[in-house]
């Protein structure tokens, strides 16, 4: 058996700094939560303790605070690179500043793959955006490989500003051939990472043959097993288990929003890539977890421009 730890965030919405418990501006620092400096502390702690770890984001890093207003996505690339994310799926809000506002600050600057299988570029945009985002990526993890296939809400044209040269296809229709392609490449452990909401996440788990795990976003769904640690009321257990049409138990996860929690899922695979077991819970990033001083110093450096903007 081979064990993989999936760390995941979604719908962070520009909460680079720590926030209050309700994800608004931090007032009393001793009771604040989240933020990339605190997230980094916890991620590094887990990376040090466990051998096979992936850090994934399921979209909507863009939009939500003055950080995005001022830095327009440059802050997302910078701090996700600093945390060494392994992959990200495109969310609808990544298109809020148009395709150019996605390409220049994020797609060209991210060191990690940015994914969506159901977004197809056409016309003059096709060559401009080619290779900057991918339908899937095969990631080496220790001596194994894991396939990550991305998806984005097909409602994005109605929710954001992707323009006329991007076609948002049905998620299940677009995902299946990409998963099939991964299978032909002998990739037998596949994560669907995307931003279409919990209902679609569950449908993907049910309908897309070959998907082993679904890591989602968009609906800000909070799942938890046991007594929840803060104010969020769980919509179900973590992971939420869907029985696929071909009889497999597929774990589906999401980690609320605003960087308040770090999703933590441990998956055990057999030698054929079948999920043997899955367990975990979102980790509440409260003040018991110190902010990493180095990332915090970087945040403070970037913060200066925001203070100038405010005044």
């Amino acid at each position: 058996a081979w064990e993989l730890t999936i760390l995941h965030t979604n719908d962070v919405h520009s909460r680079l700094e720590q926030t209050s418990e309700d994800s608004s501006k931090c007032v009393n620092a001793s009771r604040c939560m989240g933020g990339v400096a605190r997230l980094f502390t916890k991620v590094q702690q887990i990376r040090r303790a466990e051998p096979n770890v992936l850090l994934l984001d399921a979209g909507d890093q863009y939009q939500g605070t003055i950080w995005f207003t001022v830095y327009k996505g440059a802050e997302v690339a910078h701090f996700m690179n600093a945390l060494r994310y392994d992959a990200m799926a495109l969310g609808n809000h990544e298109f809020d500043n148009g395709v150019e506002g996605l390409i220049e600050p994020l797609l060209k600057e991210a060191k990690f793959p940015i994914l969506s299988a159901n977004i197809k570029a056409k016309g003059p945009l096709a060559s401009q955006i080619s290779g900057l985002y991918l339908p899937y990526k095969v990631l080496p993890v220790g001596d194994e490989v894991v396939g990550i296939v991305g998806y984005t809400s097909k409602e994005t044209p109605f929710l954001s500003n992707p323009g006329t040269n991007l076609v948002f296809e049905d998620e299940i229709t677009a995902l299946q051939p990409e998963v099939d392609k991964l299978k032909t490449l002998n990739v037998n452990k596949i994560i669907a990472l995307g931003h279409s909401g919990f209902e679609m996440d569950k449908l993907i788990a049910q309908k897309v043959r070959g998907v082993d795990v679904v890591v989602g976003g968009h609906s800000n769904t909070f799942l938890y097993t046991g007594n929840p640690p803060s104010k969020e009321v769980p919509a179900g257990k973590y992971p939420f288990i869907v029985t696929s049409d071909d009889g497999r138990k597929v774990p589906v996860v999401q980690a609320y929003a605003f960087g308040k929690y770090l999703g933590y899922l441990k998956i055990e695979f057999d030698e054929r890539g079948n999920v043997i077991s899955s367990h975990g819970n979102p980790i509440l990033l409260n003040s018991s977890i110190p902010e990493d001083p180095s990332i915090k110093a970087d945040i403070n450096k970037w913060r200066i421009k925001l203070d100038n903007y405010s005044t």
């Epitope: 980094f40 590094q44 990376r47 040090r48 600093a82 060494r84 392994d86 060191k111 990690f112 990631l139 080496p140 993890v141 220790g142 001596d143 194994e144 490989v145 990493d292 180095s294 990332i295 110093a297 970087d298």
Partner: antibody
Framework: QVQLVESGGGVVQPGRSLRLSCATS????????MHWVRQAPGKGLEWVAV????????YYPDSVKGRFTISRDNSKNTLYLQMNSLRAEDTAVYYC??????????????WGQGTMVTVSS | DIQMTQSPSSLSASVGDRVTITCRAS??????LAWYQQKPEKAPKSLIY???SLQSGVPSRFSGSGSGTDFTLTISSLQPEDFATYYC?????????FGGGTKVEIK
């Protein structure tokens, strides 16, 4: 167990070329970034080159850029360093070392025993 | 390029001593720092990665700490086999760079 074995070192005249090899075993070679690190006699360690796990990117310090080329053959589990326009200051023990499984810079968890390269007329 | 400055360049100590080696980066490198041990005529050996994580098989008397620009390698109780040269290395960004080394000698 995991092993890295360098070969190809020797004595070479300034301006000439040499190709080093690093044969690996005991791990999934195609999953790891691989590096060359050198050590001049009596001196410290100097990083020379990296090639990412899939060969997509290569990075070098200014001291060897344009003269040295790192490559890999994942089907043979072997790493190479082609050294051209060699200079006296390239004299060193050359180690191959295993890096990480991503595109981010990394440390080296496994080292070979090294191969000596002497550039002298 | 990020410069790594190690101090001291050499030190003399006795078996059982607590030994501390420091490494300073010319700019912030978060926790992307490793430590290596090298004995004469041998290849370096990885001791610590991510500033404080012990590499598998390394004795627990070795520990690392620090973040940003200042880092420390500590040997809590020096053993005969620990007499060697120690190097720090940053892997925050390319080009990867090493400290100049600290030679730990028998007093």
């Amino acid at each position: 167990q995991v092993q890295l074995v360098e070969s190809g070192g020797g004595v070479v005249q300034p301006g000439r070329s040499l190709r080093l090899s690093c044969a690996t075993s005991g791990f999934t070679f195609s999953n790891y970034g691989m590096h060359w690190v050198r050590q001049a006699p009596g001196k410290g360690l100097e990083w020379v080159a990296v090639i990412l796990y899939d060969g997509s990117n290569k990075y070098y310090p200014d001291s060897v850029k344009g003269r040295f080329t790192i490559s890999r053959d994942n089907s043979k589990n072997t790493l190479y360093l082609q050294m051209n326009s060699l200079r006296a200051e390239d004299t060193a023990v050359y180690y191959c070392a295993r890096g990480g499984s991503s595109w981010y810079p990394d440390s080296f968890d496994i080292w070979g025993q090294g191969t000596m390269v002497t550039v002298s007329s | 390029d990020i410069q790594m400055t190690q101090s001291p360049s050499s030190l003399s100590a006795s078996v059982g001593d607590r030994v501390t080696i420091t490494c300073r980066a010319s700019q912030g490198i978060s926790s992307w720092l490793a430590w290596y041990q090298q004995k004469p005529e041998k290849a370096p050996k990885s001791l610590i990665y991510a500033a404080s994580s012990l590499q598998s098989g390394v004795p627990s008397r070795f520990s690392g700490s620090g973040s940003g620009t200042d880092f420390t390698l500590t040997i809590s109780s020096l053993q005969p086999e620990d007499f060697a040269t120690y190097y720090c290395q940053q892997y925050n960004s390319y080009p990867l760079t090493f400290g100049g080394g600290t030679k730990v000698e028998i007093k």
